[in-house]
Interface confidence: low
């Protein structure tokens, strides 16, 4: 299963199968992930050794039991892959590091005002992978506001040093963030020149451009198909790269196909794993396991729950079958590659489905780094848990924020309901940042059932807490995946960067916002609160924040969004914005449902028919 | 600040086409929508469609669909509105408009079309 | 398309006085109203806007009520700077749409 515990002051020992330099546990941890063999990590801040050779070392470890022996290293933080975690498995990385040079080949420096322009240069750049820019404060002045754009062989720097007034971070191109564009032709009897940066073993081309897409220098790619004239080379898929970005040639050859990575697409990138299953295909590797199965797709789940399986076989031969069930060959290699691939036989085969976002399991996400006052606008992917509910009578506007917390349920403010609650009006938009983009062509969740908290009652600030139950589920992308739930009974005070975020007002008697805003706000307590708000009962279930000089606050429009506090480099959903004596007003917090307070509740309504929790909050 | 710089006054005969620019600074370009909004002489005022220059979709007023295109350069924050098929009632001050939300707050100073045989 | 009527087309008012220009629509626009002033050969100036928000550089003399299909604004006392033609304009649906416009003039 999915585990996301972080061991602080601990390192596991031995299993090592790759190590690099990485900025934080977070980055090291992605890496893992993605690694075919990596279920265990360990990393090395800065702070935690002297040895300048292993500072910010992130090492990569495997297991047959899945599991090491964990030794006691004051600052060292280990943890699993996170692999079979669904969405939240991500390669986008948004963080800032500052203090921290990322060393590299440096093939592109020019002077730009700000560490998030650096950013953008290196995403809109395709060959650079990560970035340093020098501010303003630098000690040698010509090299002040320089932007160096980076790369290297594996896609991590090469060496990372402590300086001073210097920010690194990393293209965000595995966010889909990039403004290159990217081609999705795949362009069949054509091989494409240039340096090969890897060669594996894949059925189609469909499998090379996905491994292409995730590999760190791979911008195109040329597959050799099963009929291709010399034997050694079918299926061979070359990943390349050049100088200029793109093939300097390309070749007619019949029965190869050529295409580019997908890694420049904007909005939406493939998912780094592959779930096609090809009947009448051998799929040859590592031994990891043999089990009887009845069917190809149970095969396949079961590769997927084994978390070291890469691929399997499905046997049809009368000797692997007995009764309704055949053998399932679980596999593995080095590079998460079949070792060999033959045509023509009776098994059917494919590759686990660890990688996959669309997992169903907890909904944490750690990944990310009424208009708001005070706020900024916000960017695409930065809270994908955010939706628009908004209403179509005559014409159509945002009511309401909400907050997804699984495939098919939205945790939303009941108040946002008082006077509508047909549902068939409602119209639920979802990885969206500007309410500009919604056409009529944009598409939209209807609402299956709207569930009220029973204690609920129109005009009163109490139990303001609704569970939007969704038509239809939807899919996980870097634009749209849920909030992790607090566990029951939590503490806000361990909160200390909480961020509210919708399209309400930008002030009192404001309008509706275009572009999604944020703003940072700190958790008051409730003793404070009620001085505040001495006409009124602040409950226990109830979290405010605010600022004492006002300022910044949620307004009318983003009720029922989310407040959320990152805490251990995860986002949790702790409170729905609910009301509020004005927007901002000094000494006048904004009061929010606290949602711990109602976790059995939301699990209690979501469970599914089989008795199944649609989502659960974490361990 | 936020600015918004039309390109000069046209004349044009009927049946041609003419095409306006707007170059925008002050605010991130591709963040808010561009609207075009026409005022005939001692007439109204007209509201033709709009540009997100982030994504290139467009929103026009059917009244004008088939003869109005809104396009974006982002490398230089300009928009440009080409109306084709131009007829005499086409004449008219052109004006680009940047909501706030959802009414203009800013706008160009206007470019005069005069279609005159 | 949501039709606005603006009403009077035009009036003559001396400084001082109380001014009331209303704007009614074809069908219910839920507040998504805004006002403009608009002076010979110049652009519209956005005056005011949804539930009364009142646009930076305007004097709180202009103020803006109503709800529904009827809308309406006033200008508490007329100064010489406020002759101008002023417009409605709907933005609760697209095609947005404009009043025909009041010109206020001096009497």
């Known amino acids: 299963g999915c585990l996301t515990q972080l061991y602080e002051n601990a390192f596991f020992r031995g299993g090592d199968v790759a190590s690099m330099y990485t900025p934080n546990a977070q980055y090291c941890q992605m890496r893992c992930t993605f690694h075919p063999r990596c279920l265990l990590f360990s990393f090395l801040p800065a702070s935690s050794i002297n040895d300048m050779e292993k500072r910010f070392g992130c090492f990569l470890k495997d297991s047959v039991t899945g599991t090491l022996p964990k030794v006691h290293r004051t600052g060292a933080v280990s943890g699993h892959s996170l692999k079979q975690c669904g969405h939240q498995i991500s390669a986008c990385h948004r963080d800032i590091y500052k203090g921290v040079d990322m060393r590299g080949v440096n093939f592109n420096v020019s002077k730009v005002s700000s560490v998030e322009e650096c950013q953008k240069r290196c995403t809109s750049n395709i060959r650079c992978q990560f970035f340093s820019y020098a501010t303003q404060t630098f000690h040698k002045a010509e090299y002040r506001n320089n932007c160096l754009l980076k790369y290297s062989p594996g896609g991590t720097p090469t060496a990372i040093k402590v300086l001073s007034n210097v920010e690194s971070g990393f293209s965000l191109k595995p966010c889909a963030l990039s403004e290159i564009g990217c081609h999705m032709n795949i362009f069949q009897h054509l091989a494409f020149s240039d340096v090969d940066v890897a060669r594996v073993l894949t059925p189609d081309a469909f499998v090379c451009r996905t491994i292409c897409t995730y590999h760190p220098n791979c911008l195109f790619f040329t597959f050799y198909t099963n009929v291709w004239k010399i034997e050694s080379q079918r299926n061979v898929c070359l990943l390349k790269t050049s100088e200029s970005g793109t093939p300097s040639s390309s070749t007619p050859q019949e029965n190869t196909i050529s295409g580019y990575s997908l890694l420049t697409c904007k909005r939406t990138l493939p998912e780094p794993c592959h779930s096609k299953i090809y009947p009448g295909v051998d799929f040859g590797g590592e031994e990891l396991n043999v089990t009887f199965v009845k069917g190809v797709n149970v095969c396949q789940e079961t590769c997927t729950k084994m978390i070291r399986c890469q691929f399997f076989t499905y046997s049809l031969l009368p000797e692997d079958c007995k009764e309704e069930k055949c053998k399932c060959f679980l596999r593995l290699s080095m590079d998460g590659s079949p070792t060999r691939i033959a045509y023509g036989t009776q098994g059917s085969s494919g590759y686990s489905l660890r990688l996959c976002n669309t997992g169903d399991n907890s909904v944490c996400t750690t990944k990310t780094s009424t208009r708001i006052v005070g706020g900024t606008n916000s960017s695409w992917g930065e809270w994908p848990w955010q939706v628009s509910l908004q209403v179509k009578l005559t014409a159509q506007r945002h009511l309401c924020g909400g907050s997804l917390i699984g495939h098919q349920w939205v945790l939303t403010a009941a108040h946002c309901f008082d006077g509508l609650p047909l549902q068939d009006v409602w119209r639920i938009y979802s990885g969206i940042l500007n309410l500009s983009d919604i056409t009529k062509d944009t598409p939209f969740s209807q609402i299956k059932e709207i569930i009220i908290h029973q204690n609920y009652k129109v005009s009163e600030g109490n139990h303001d807490i609704a569970l939007i139950k969704l038509q239809a589920p939807l899919n996980y992308t870097e634009f749209q995946k849920p909030i992790c739930l607090p566990s029951k009974g939590d503490t806000s005070t361990i909160y200390t960067n909480c961020w509210v975020t919708g399209w309400g007002f930008s002030k009192e008697k404001g309008e509706i916002q275009n572009i999604l805003q944020k703003v940072n706000i700190p958790l008051v307590t409730n003793e404070e609160c009620q001085k505040r708000y001495q006409d009124y009962k602040i409950t226990q279930r109830m979290v405010c924040a605010g600022y004492k000089e006002g300022g910044k606050d949620a307004c009318k429009g983003d009720s029922g969004g989310p407040l959320v506090c990152k805490h251990n480099g995860m986002w949790r959903l702790v409170g729905i914005t609910s009301w509020g004596e004005g927007c901002a007003r000094r000494e006048q917090p904004g009061v929010y449902t606290k949602v711990a307070e109602y976790m059995d509740w939301i699990l209690e309504k979501t469970q599914s028919s089989d008795g199944k929790a649609q989502m659960q909050s974490p361990a | 600040q936020v600015q918004l710089v039309q390109s000069g006054a046209e004349v044009k005969k009927p049946g041609a086409s003419v095409k306006v620019s707007c170059k925008a600074s002050?605010?991130?370009?591709?963040?808010?929508?561009m609207h075009w909004v026409r005022q005939a002489p001692g007439q109204g005022l007209e509201w033709m469609g709009a540009i997100h220059p982030g994504s290139g979709g467009t929103a026009y007023n059917q009244k004008f669909k088939g003869r109005v295109t809104m396009t974006r350069d982002t490398s230089t924050s300009t928009v440009y509105m080409e109306l084709s098929s131009l007829r005499s009632e086409d004449t008219a001050v052109y004006y680009c408009?940047?909501?706030?939300?959802?009414?203009?707050?800013?706008w160009g100073q206007g470019t005069l079309v005069t279609v005159s045989s | 398309d949501i039709q606005m009527t603006q009403s009077p087309s035009s009036l003559s008012a001396s400084v001082g006085e109380r001014v009331t220009i209303t704007c009614k629509a074809s069908?219910?626009?839920?507040?998504?109203l805004a006002w403009y002033q608009q002076k010979p050969g110049k652009a519209p100036k956005l005056l005011l806007y949804?539930?009364?928000g009142l646009e930076a550089g305007f004097h709180l003399r202009f103020s803006g009520s109503g709800s529904g299909t009827h809308y309406t604004l006033t200008i508490a006392s007329l100064q010489p700077e406020d002759f101008a033609t002023y417009y409605c304009?709907?933005?609760?649906?697209?095609?947005?749409?404009f009043g025909q416009g009041t010109k206020v003039e001096i009497k």
């Open positions: 304009q709907q933005y609760w649906s697209t095609p947005w749409t």
């Open positions: 002050g605010y991130t370009f591709t963040d808010y929508e």
């Open positions: 949804g539930e009364t």
């Open positions: 069908e219910d626009i839920y507040n998504r």
């Open positions: 408009a940047r909501p706030y939300g959802y009414p203009f707050a800013y």
